[in-house]
């Protein structure tokens, strides 16, 4: 706790001090205040700079004074023996003793008095800017007419600071101008424009004159111009040093004039004015901007279109243009938008095709669709190759946005019949000989599979299960090879309306329009054992010769057995229709006058007792195409026979071309379509 | 009528092997499929294996698999299983069936023969 | 290799009852199973294949449905003459799995 005075004895005093000594006082008189200290008595072993034994006074980090020896007054009509003035309030006194005295040495007495300071001349720095009041334990400034003591009490200015201009143009000039500006001062002025317009400031070099900068280059007395994080200044000298014309891209100005104690001058004089901000005429690639004008600025409007091929992406919604707005910061809206490259995406993948992964997608890309060659072929044309266009559509030149399309190739067996071992009647087949053949599980028959959903049978076949369980790609019919196989689930029969339908199938005489078609629930994957066989054209080269050779083949009766395990097949000449009427019917279930011949019927067979039989209904009579050899037709379907080796009949299909194309159409799928 | 007619009993002792004959009679053995099956006295039926003459293979169940060698003798009309390196627990009748078609698993069923494993 | 799982092991019934047998294959089979009747030193004898389709000669009163994993064969009203075993079989790939068997005994 701070006092005004006190006394302060060396150990045991006035009896001597003990060796091996050291205590310290903290003095303090509050504050304003100095401290008075003086010994009335001093009697400390001597020694060279008080090595040995000493008392110590210290006024912050300063050492005031170091005392040995014996001291008397000087002046009999004061005690005092040795003082010390300090304008601090704090002082330390420390005092010391070695370990051994030669003598009894009694040590010291001493007092302090607080006293006060005249902080306007006891000090180097002087602590006001104007003038310094002294009283006792303090002081105070004041300051000359028209100015203003500061916050921190010591300084003075003028009163220049607050003044908000608001108007779109107007003049600034330093305190008094062109009168000297005052010192110590600090005045700060702003400019708060409506926002989209920038502060402009025009100054004339001979209208600025301020205190010049010191040997360092710092102005003693400066000029700064503030918007936003943007400094311009600070300015001094004689004439203006900086751009006489300031454009400061902001709507908010602060003008801060500072000076110091010395050098005033006539200050400066400036002119501002409000511009609409200007955005920057940016080079945005791949567009084209409207309007087209020199330059643009605040509430600017322009229409920025992109050039073809290419898109502004805004999420995931791509547009050709977008507008963009001279803003009040002087910045475009939609700055971010950019006109892109179109990027047509990865390409749709097709069925029973491909498209090889583009090493681009974006406007101008290239890319090539191919089908499953040998077993799918590109049925819309266009040659599969699709460029990216402008509208981020992949286009074909011919088909223009509609994908390929990927259809079955028809007729062409992946391996040729021969007829190689001798088996009475026909021959061992493989499947890939006739990969259209489709089995029938019940009744136990074939069909012909003529493109992806389609499977063309006879009537007769599915007349009794319309509900068929169908299996394509093998030879044999063994259990576990169809387990292998595809099996084909139906969707729906349809049999030619003018089939007859009897009560009792088993006594039918009329076989006439024996066809049926199933459409399948699922499409028909193609390769090498499953394949379709076209269908013959509607000309007459279609129409067939007696003699005309076609193949049959099926997993029906053979001389052996019932039925065969493995793919029968043999290659049979069209006989006159007359021969199947000539033949016995074998098992006659009524007079032979009864069973009905038809144009709509093909005779075929009766060479080398090589003929279709029961279980190979349905099968197609295939024949090799007249317009392309490489290719087979079904130009019958097995039907019905009189005797088994001899001839048989088989569903002229030529005849019935309309009523399939009609019947698939009317029940495709959208996929198909 | 297609007829499968099996060999006749056989008594081994562990560790010797066994050779099954079944004879096709009413067809010819190319045109069909050999499986074979046994069933322990009071057990179950247990597929063995079979040839399949598509591939020109023989497959064998895992539990027999270098154990098991079917073969054909196409000339005679004659399958073949011999099963090596007996064990008590192979003992059980022994089954030669033909795989049917469209569907149908086994066909015609042999006699059986029944091949005893004792010391 | 594909298991197959049949239950019961055992079942007792008396004529004139309707009895279910299932089956549950390890993996999907679609409809390759078979159910077979076998009678103490006889062969066994198929009366359903493909899941459902019923053998020719076996009487109506057999009846199998089910496809992928789980099977079943119904014996709408037992008869003195089906008391026998029951085996189904998968046979979906060249590895043909029999069920370990379903004893149908008298009550």
């Known amino acids: 706790e701070p006092t005004m005075y006190g006394e302060i004895l060396s150990p045991n005093y006035p009896q001597a001090y003990p060796s091996e000594v050291e205590k310290s006082w903290d003095i303090e008189v509050p504050e304003g205040y100095g401290i008075h200290l003086y010994f009335t008595h001093l009697d400390i072993e001597l020694s060279e700079n008080c090595a040995y034994d000493s008392v110590q006074i210290i006024s912050g980090d300063t050492e005031e004074g170091r005392l040995c020896g014996q001291r008397s007054s000087n002046n009999p009509h004061s005690p005092i023996v040795e003082e010390f003035q300090v304008p601090y309030n704090k002082l330390q006194v420390i005092f010391k003793s070695d370990f051994s005295n030669e003598e009894r040495f009694t040590g010291f007495a001493a007092y302090y008095v607080a006293t006060d300071i005249n902080e306007c001349t006891d000090f180097v720095d002087v602590p006001c800017s104007h003038f310094c009041n002294n009283f006792i334990g303090g002081y105070f400034c004041s300051c000359p007419p028209e100015y203003f003591l500061h916050d921190d009490m010591k300084n003075c200015g003028v009163n220049c600071s607050g003044d908000v201009f608001t108007a779109l143009i107007g003049e600034i000039a330093s305190p008094n101008y062109p009168k000297p500006y005052p010192e110590n001062s600090r005045c700060e002025y702003q400019i708060r424009l409506e926002k989209g317009f920038q502060v402009v400031v025009t100054l004339r070099r001979e209208d600025f004159d301020v205190e010049a900068a010191d040997s360092a280059g710092n102005c003693l007395d400066s000029l700064v111009f503030v918007a936003g994080d943007r400094q311009f200044g600070p300015y001094c000298g004689h004439g203006f040093p900086g751009p006489l014309n300031i454009e400061t891209k902001s709507n908010a100005l602060d003008i801060i004039f500072q000076t110091d104690l010395t050098g005033q001058k006539k200050g400066w004089k400036l002119r501002y004015h409000g511009d609409p901000m200007p955005c920057p005429k940016e080079d945005t690639p791949n567009s084209v901007w409207e309007p087209a004008k020199a330059k643009y600025v605040f509430r600017d409007v322009v229409q920025i279109t992109c050039l073809d091929g290419f898109e502004v992406v805004e999420g995931r919604v791509g547009a050709t243009s977008f507008y963009s707005t001279c803003q009040s910061n002087g910045k475009w809206s939609n700055s971010k938008l950019k006109c892109q490259p179109v990027d047509c995406g990865i390409p749709e993948s097709i069925e029973n095709g491909k498209v090889e992964d583009p090493e681009s997608t974006l406007f101008g890309s290239v890319i090539r669709y191919t089908c499953e060659e040998p077993y799918y072929y590109m049925e819309n044309g266009g040659g599969g190759e699709y460029h990216c266009a402008g509208n981020g559509s992949w286009v074909n030149e011919v088909l223009g946005p509609e994908l390929p399309k990927c259809v079955p190739v028809c007729g062409v067996p992946r391996e040729p019949f021969e007829e190689k071992q001798r088996i009475i009647g026909g021959s061992d087949a493989d499947i890939k000989n006739f990969p259209w053949q489709v089995f029938f599980d019940n009744p136990w028959a074939g069909g012909a599979l003529i493109n992806e959903y389609w499977v063309l049978t006879a009537a007769h076949v599915v007349e009794g299960n319309r509900e068929p369980t169908m299996y394509v790609g093998s030879t044999s019919v063994q259990t576990s090879r169809l387990a292998k196989s595809k099996m084909l689930t139906p969707e729906h029969v349809f049999i030619h309306p003018g089939w007859k339908l009897l009560e009792v199938p088993e006594g039918r005489t009329n076989f006439d329009n024996d066809i049926a078609l199933v459409r399948l629930k699922d499409p028909v994957k193609m390769g090498p054992t499953v394949s379709p066989i076209c269908l013959p054209g509607t000309s007459s080269d279609y129409n067939l010769m007696d003699g005309d050779l076609g193949l049959i083949s099926g997993w029906g009766r053979t001389e052996k057995r019932d039925r065969a395990v493995r793919l029968k097949a043999a290659r049979l000449p069209v006989a006159p229709l007359r021969k199947c009427k000539e033949v016995k019917v074998e098992k006659p279930t009524a007079d032979a006058e009864a069973y009905v011949f038809t144009p709509n019927m093909i005779c075929a067979g009766g060479e080398k007792g090589m003929d279709s039989c029961k279980g190979d209904s349905g099968g197609a009579f295939a024949v090799q195409d007249p317009n392309d050899k490489t290719k087979f037709y079904a130009a019958g379907l097995v039907s019905w026979g009189p005797q088994c080796g001899t001839y048989g009949l088989y569903t002229r299909v030529k005849n019935y071309v309309d009523w399939i194309m009609k019947t698939m159409q009317e029940n495709s799928t959208p996929r198909e379509d | 009528q297609v007829q499968l007619v099996q060999s006749g009993a056989e008594v081994k002792k562990p560790g010797a092997s066994v050779k099954v004959s079944c004879k096709v009679s009413?067809?010819?053995?190319?045109?069909?499929?050999m499986h074979w099956v046994r069933q322990a006295p009071g057990k179950g039926l247990e597929w063995m294996g079979t040839?399949?003459?598509?591939?020109?293979?023989?497959i064998y169940a895992q539990k027999f698999q270098g154990r098991v060698t079917m073969t054909e003798d196409t000339s005679t009309d004659t399958a073949y299983m011999e099963l090596s390196s007996l064990r008590s627990e192979d003992t059980a009748v022994y089954y030669c069936?033909?795989?049917?078609?469209?569907?149908?698993?086994?066909?015609?069923w042999g006699q059986g023969t029944l091949v005893t494993v004792s010391s | 290799d594909i298991q197959m799982t049949q239950s019961p092991s055992t079942l007792s019934a008396s004529v004139g009852d309707r009895v279910t047998i299932t089956c549950r294959a390890s993996q999907s089979i679609s409809s390759w199973l078979a159910w077979y009747q076998q009678k103490p030193g006889k062969a066994p004898k198929l009366l359903i294949y493909?899941?459902?389709s019923l053998e020719s000669g076996v009487p109506s009163r057999f009846s199998g449905s089910g496809s992928g994993t789980e099977f079943t064969l119904t014996i709408s009203s037992l008869q003195p003459d089906d008391f026998a075993t029951y085996y189904c079989?998968?046979?979906?790939?060249?590895?043909?799995?029999f069920g370990q068997g379903t004893k149908v005994e008298i009550k």
């Open positions: 009413g067809d010819t053995l190319t045109e069909l499929s």
């Open positions: 079989q998968s046979y979906n790939s060249y590895v043909w799995t």
């Open positions: 040839f399949d003459p598509e591939e020109g293979e023989t």
């Open positions: 493909k899941a459902s």
């Open positions: 069936v033909t795989e049917g078609l469209a569907g149908v698993p086994f066909d015609l």
